[in-house]
């Protein structure tokens, strides 16, 4: 990872977006064997610890405060040059979060999308943020930035993501900032998981004892496939969240998850999806829809012994 033409490459791990009180490792990649480097901050709110300091390999900065937000560069050690140092590296912007109330993040048309579609992620707040930033978990590069549009006491920005492919699936958060402190970001929005479907073969969905049951009768939905899915996700039409279970290998070489729905109270249309542990936000094609009908006395809800996942958390591993 070289900056080219005697220029080091400055990077941040795990991310350039750092919470107040957190830590970030700044690494200056220069020529092999030349590990010494110096760091400096470009604006006036300098961090005194850098002055005259020489670092090796990487420098762990923290606990960070608002004073650490800003643009950094490094110079690699060049013992035989006139100055003893290389040309300055690329600029690296460190953003410090937790400085304002969190904005809200929504997905239009929704967080569950087919491969190739486009999703609009709308970040909004009643704090008059000048800029909004969108960041995907696990990504070290700078977040996307948009100017907020202010209407009726609300500031918002629409981030267009797409056409969707597996690399764009994941957990998104957005942040806001005010004009005079562009790198001092708000607390993060609640996480929003963007899931891409349609990448693998569809599983099959069946009901035990059958798709038509008496009110009060116990119902279990089974999702299975010859594909070695690690997790199955069960969704019900009209419900915001899905349920998920670990797939279990069966003797007939299929991989299956059984979702107990409990005593039947009213019907609904169900679908299931499979996913792999390595890519928890990339799902298979949907199973064929399964209509579960309840005869007898339907009530307004179906109790769920399977804990439904929250709006977020889909993209975390099941332990």
């Amino acid at each position: 990872l070289m900056g080219g033409q005697d220029k080091p490459f400055l990077s941040a791990r795990p991310s350039t977006v750092v919470p107040r009180g957190g830590h970030v490792a700044l690494q200056c990649h220069y020529r092999r064997g030349f590990n010494n480097f110096m760091l400096y901050k470009e604006d006036r709110s300098h961090v005194p610890i850098f002055h005259g300091r020489i670092f090796q390999e990487s420098f762990i900065m923290g606990p960070v405060t608002t004073a650490h937000a800003g643009t950094y560069r490094c110079r690699g050690s060049r013992p035989h040059s006139l100055t003893g140092w290389s040309a300055p590296s690329n600029p690296l912007v460190i953003m410090v979060t937790g400085n304002h109330r969190k904005p809200s993040l929504l997905a239009h048309p929704g967080p569950l999308l087919k491969s190739g579609e486009t999703v609009i992620l709308q970040c909004w707040s009643d704090v008059m943020f000048e800029h909004f930033f969108l960041h995907r978990e696990g990504i070290s590069e700078d977040p996307s930035r948009l100017v907020g549009q202010i209407h009726d006491g609300v500031s918002k920005a629409n981030f267009s993501i797409g056409p969707l492919m597996p690399v764009l699936a994941g957990t998104y958060r957005c942040y806001g900032s005010v004009p005079h402190s562009p790198y001092q970001l708000s607390a993060p929005s609640d996480p929003l998981d963007i899931v891409i479907t349609g990448l693998y073969e569809k599983p099959s969905l069946s009901a035990q004892p059958g798709p038509t049951v008496q009110a009060g009768e116990n119902v279990t939905l089974s999702c299975s496939s010859w594909s070695s899915y690690d997790i199955y996700h069960l969704s019900r039409e009209g419900e915001a969240h899905e349920r998920r279970l670990r797939a279990v290998p069966k003797v007939n070489r299929t991989f299956q998850a059984d979702f107990p729905l409990g005593p039947a109270t009213h019907g609904g249309t169900y679908r299931c999806f499979g996913s792999f542990r390595a890519l928890p936000c990339v799902w298979s094609n949907s199973s064929d829809p399964l209509l579960v009908s309840v005869t007898g006395n339907p009530s307004s809800s179906w109790p769920s012994p399977t804990e439904p996942s929250s709006k977020s958390g889909i993209c975390r591993h099941l332990h």
């Epitope: 304002h100 109330r101 009643d126 008059m128 000048e130 005010v178 004009p179 402190s181």
Partner: antibody, heavy 115, light 107 residues
Amino acid sequence: QIQLVQSGPELKNPGETVKISCKASGYIFTNYGMNWVKQAPGKGLKWMGWINTYTGEPTYADDFKGRFAFSLETSASTAYLQINNLKNEDTATYFCAHGPWLAYWGQGTLVTVST
Amino acid sequence: DIKMTQSPSSMYASLGERVTITCKASQDINSYLSWFQLKPGKSPKTLIYRANRLVDGVPSRFSGSGSGQDFSLTISSLECEDMGIYYCLQYDELPYTFGGGTTLEIK
């Protein structure tokens, strides 16, 4: 509607301390930073600094570092400006104003420093 | 610090006249500029933010323009209640800095 109501006028001797309050209503207090602005008699406006009402972190302009202190009582939606060791040149009207572009202002508090 | 130079420092104008006040920043401040009106014994009133956005409740005869370093406030048709002192403010960078003010009086 949004209102910032400041405490009344103060007459102080040099060397004393004054604490001015700015009570906010009509909006979520922690949504907007609070700025403080000085207007000396016959002079223009001078920005003193701001306090982040979400984190409580104050930022002071160079001319207002040392004797000046911003603070908050978030539960009462109130910001404070305290001036220690008052000098004659502190005689001025002090305004609080909220938000990044100073959208709403208090009515001002006149502080007179005189022996 | 960014220096804001406001002109004129004072002016007389007739009722119904079009009035323009200018503000020049010592460096690029994008569009992060506000305009305020001060009247004796009253709270300052914010007229414009982000260089050209009218604050809710401010009469439409007030307008702002400009970006970068050069900005102006225009009153399309002067009314009696418009007399007072006008200030610009840059909020692009800390510390915020005000212009020196323009005293507007009726002829």
